[in-house]
Amino acid sequence: TPEVWVQVRMEATELSSFTIRCGFLGSGSISLVTVSWGGPNGAGGTTLAVLHPERGIRQWAPARQARWETQSSISLILEGSGASSPCANTTFCCKFASFPEGSWEACGSLPPSSDPGLSAPPTPAPILRAD
């Protein structure tokens, strides 16, 4: 069964700056990745970035830089200042659309006892849903 993992990290240099990393553990080819916060995309969540493997990347504040890390994983850096900045208990979700598996989504947030610069290991997150 395909899985999606989400890793959230607070940057040591900028305490209100976050890096989200997401990956897809499956054999299919990824056609789209959507990163949202505040809940799953389409269920109250707000889209931060959309990454397409050929057409490129769209991103919205407070996203600062989204990028593909590998063919099956992405990273997103969020701005650390401003009214729309994330806080420590913000939930981030990543939805991977792939063929032939369909859409898979997982969510995660900063581990409660995280020191700046540290993060939870990139294990599959608890919220997992196939469309």
Epitope: T46, V50, H52, E54, R55, G56, I57, W60, A61, R67
Partner: antibody, heavy 123, light 107 residues
Framework: QVQLQQSGAELVRPGASVTLSCKAS????????MHWVKQTPVHGLEWIGA????????AYNQKFKGKAILTADKSSSTAYMELRSLTSEDSAVYYC????????????????WGQGTTLTVSS | DIVMTQSQKFMSTSVGDRVSITCKAS??????VAWYQQKPGQSPKALIY???NRHTGVPDRFTGSGSGTDFTLTISNVQSEDLADYFC?????????FGAGTKLELK
């Protein structure tokens, strides 16, 4: 037919602010992001940023963060760009141009542009 | 930021000629490139999107090709109305960036 009608030329003093407008017609305003592009003889075309009129979400070129503020009014199908703390470096032609919001759309590019607004900053 | 380099600022051509305008990206942008034509005093007009697809109403003498880092806009059988500036745009990642432009002029 699709039209992006931009506001007229502006002559403003250094240090002032100005708001440029772009009125869209001939399509569903919320189906497309509105982007703004600056053009000067020295730097050519530079992407300033974008707004999604449906959500109000914005994206900015770091170079123009704090300089430009993008807003949109769904009721009048108009996008706005406020430029602050103007200097002579801001003298340019500014264009609005639309980009379809869905990444998997067939037509994925800036397909229509406004006629441009010339901004002159001079004392 | 991704830099889009149009190495030729000017290109001289004659009516009926075939001309190729090139654009090089500083990193792999897949096929996330568009081409625009701009005449003096006018706004840019879309020609090509996703590297090789023609915008509605663009004559078939305009052809786009390339992927990755190297892109080409070819105009076969150049017409006098084709004399203009041509820009490439990458939309692989933000900030979106344009090439400096290539001015097509008569010999």
């Amino acid at each position: 037919q699709v039209q992006l009608q931009q506001s007229g030329a502006e002559l403003v003093r250094p240090g002032a602010s100005v708001t440029l407008s772009c009125k869209a017609s001939g399509y569903t305003f919320t189906d497309y992001e509105m982007h703004w592009v600056k053009q000067t003889p020295v730097h050519g075309l530079e992407w300033i940023g974008a707004i999604d009129p449906e959500t109000g979400g914005t994206a900015y070129n770091q170079k123009f963060k704090g300089k430009a503020i993008l807003t949109a009014d769904k009721s009048s199908s108009t996008a706005y760009m406020e430029l602050r703390s103007l200097t002579s470096e801001d003298s340019a032609v500014y264009y609005c141009t639309r980009w379809i919001t869905t990444v998997v759309a067939t037509l994925y590019y800036f397909d229509y542009w406004g006629q441009g607004t010339t901004l002159t900053v001079s004392s | 930021d991704i830099v889009m380099t149009q190495s030729q600022k000017f290109m001289s051509t004659s009516v009926g000629d075939r001309v190729s305008i090139t654009c090089k990206a500083s990193q792999n942008v897949r096929t996330a490139v568009a081409w625009y034509q701009q005449k003096p005093g006018q706004s840019p007009k879309a020609l090509i999107y996703l590297a090789s697809n023609r915008h509605t109403g663009v004559p078939d003498r305009f052809t786009g090709s390339g992927s990755g880092t190297d892109f080409t806009l070819t105009i076969s059988n150049v017409q006098s109305e084709d004399l203009a500036d041509y820009f490439c745009l990458q939309h692989w990642n933000y900030p979106l960036t344009f090439g400096a432009g290539t001015k097509l002029e008569l010999k």
